[in-house]
């Protein structure tokens, strides 16, 4: 139901305060009485929080997928919906909650945790994995002087990453979603672990580029795990660290 949709998208975390505009000093988002979100922007007011719009599953949190809120509803209006639990109906893996995948139209347990978690995050944060939904609605009903086939440049408004030119992705910046550069090796990235963590980000970063994934920056001098940055790193640098 739409109520559960609203609840699943209620208050979502903001991007980390490091690595650029993700956190502007001296600003805050007022999302609910008595709750202050540092790293947001004081000019934004969220009186009645709206479900987060999306065009691709990747734009939603790891416990969500992108679809129309109503069965057989307007394909042009898609939002992040709460994932389907085990034994619920599904049409694709992204619809199923972490630890499950879609098999024969039903969400079933994945013993290997193959379709979600670290492995899926590595895949979805890699360049070129653009699962654009066949949503059946054009970017504009009337295209002024802009040709339909034109791919967006940096700073162009977009609805989905497939609207953007190669090397760019569609990410939110304040009240619009715009084409931004895909992240390069060593650049700070945002790891979305919590449910629906894209929802209140007013400055979304792109995913990591080809051959890269978003991982904790290995820094042995860092005492606190929580303060560690995530950066785009080469896949082959993935080593298992055993704790003694």
């Amino acid at each position: 139901t739409l109520n559960s949709v609203l609840n699943s998208n209620a208050i979502k975390n903001l991007p980390p305060p490091l690595g650029g505009a993700a956190g502007h000093p001296g600003s805050a988002v007022s999302a609910a009485p008595g709750i202050l979100y540092p790293g947001g922007n004081k000019y934004q007011t969220i009186d009645n929080y709206q479900p987060y719009p999306c065009a691709e599953d990747e734009e939603c949190g790891t416990d969500e997928y992108c679809a129309s809120p109503t069965r057989g509803g307007d394909a042009g209006v898609q939002i992040c919906l709460a994932c389907r639990k085990r034994r619920k109906r599904c049409m694709r893996h992204a619809m199923c909650c972490p630890g499950n995948y879609c098999k024969n139209g039903i969400c079933v347990s994945s013993d290997q945790n193959h379709f979600r978690g670290e492995i899926e995050e590595t895949i979805t944060e890699s360049f070129g994995n653009d699962h654009s939904t066949l949503d059946g609605y054009s970017r504009r009903t009337t295209l002024s002087s802009k040709m339909y086939h034109t791919k967006g440049q940096e700073g162009s408004v977009c609805l989905r990453s497939s609207d953007c030119a190669s090397g760019l992705c569609c990410a939110r910046h304040f009240w619009s979603k715009i084409c931004k550069p895909v992240l390069k090796e060593g650049q700070v990235c945002t790891k979305h672990r919590r449910k629906g963590s894209h929802g209140l980000e007013i400055f979304q970063r792109c995913y990591c580029g080809e051959g890269l994934s978003c991982r904790i920056q290995k820094d042995h001098h860092q005492a606190s795990n929580s303060s560690r940055l995530h950066t785009c790193q080469r896949h082959h640098h993935h080593h298992h660290h055993h704790h003694h």
Epitope: Q50, G76, T142, I178, P181
Partner: antibody, heavy 117, light 111 residues
Framework: EVQLVESGGGLVQPGGSLRLSCAAS????????ISWVRQAPGKGLEWVAS???????YYPDSVKGRFTISRDNAKNSLYLQMNSLRAEDTAVYYC???????????WGQGTTVTVSS | EIVLTQSPATLSLSPGERATLSCRAS??????????INWYQQKPGQAPRLLIY???KQGSGIPARFSGSGSGTDFTLTISSLEPEDFAVYYC?????????FGGGTKVEIK
């Protein structure tokens, strides 16, 4: 063709209220951000409010608490409810959309608001 | 908020001449690999018209004689050869942060 047509301007006394409308056509209204920008006589441009395609609203300190931006996607319309009007709110009010670029790339012709006793 | 300072306030030139307009920001308007600066043209009694977005990219239907350059805090709008219809007021705007702010404008007038 993208069109934005403002209406609702007029003369109002200080402390009064006014509601501006902007009728949009030629694009998928519900998907895009739309804003109000004003220009006082002989002055420069000043941003007044914005609303995203998903309904978040943004205001500068100068109008926060007095002005409310809203949209009716079913009617392809944008509104600006202006309360507690002051003389310094006198300006031409434009609605502007961000369709192709992260900028105000389409503008209406403007509607004039005069706050005077 | 980010303050944009445009110079000169007035530029007196003849048709065919090159116009160079400056916009300086109080802090960098670059982020995510993008310069969040836009340029608009406004003629008397008309709404503004977008010329350049993201620092250097041309808006739809904008003649090639208009170009934008710069990064960080210093930006330039160049009109390579002024046409009679180019005499107007030009504004820069930043959209890196809310509130979006505009410069005070540069009036390009006929010499």
């Amino acid at each position: 063709e993208v069109q934005l047509v403002e209406s609702g301007g007029g003369l109002v006394q200080p402390g009064g209220s006014l509601r501006l409308s902007c009728a949009a056509s030629g694009f998928t209204f519900s998907s895009y951000a739309i804003s109000w920008v004003r220009q006082a006589p002989g002055k420069g441009l000043e941003w007044v409010a914005s609303v995203s395609g998903w309904g978040d609203t943004y205001y500068p300190d100068s109008v926060k608490g007095r002005f409310t931006i809203s949209r009716d996607n079913a009617k392809n319309s944008l509104y600006l409810q202006m309360n507690s009007l002051r003389a310094e709110d006198t300006a031409v009010y434009y609605c502007a959309s961000s369709l192709d670029n992260y900028a105000f790339d389409y503008w209406g012709q403007g509607t004039t608001v005069t706050v005077s006793s | 908020e980010i303050v944009l300072t445009q110079s000169p306030a007035t530029l007196s030139l003849s048709p065919g001449e090159r116009a160079t307009l400056s916009c300086r920001a109080s802090e960098s308007v670059d982020d995510f690999g993008i310069s969040f600066i836009n340029w608009y043209q406004q003629k008397p009694g008309q709404a503004p018209r977008l010329l350049i977005y993201a620092g250097s990219k041309q808006g739809s239907g904008i003649p090639a004689r208009f170009s934008g350059s710069g990064s960080g805090t210093d930006f330039t709008l160049t009109i390579s050869s002024l046409e009679p219809e180019d005499f107007a007021v030009y504004y820069c705007q930043q959209l890196k942060e809310v509130p979006p702010t505009f410069g005070g404008g540069t009036k390009v007038e006929i010499k």
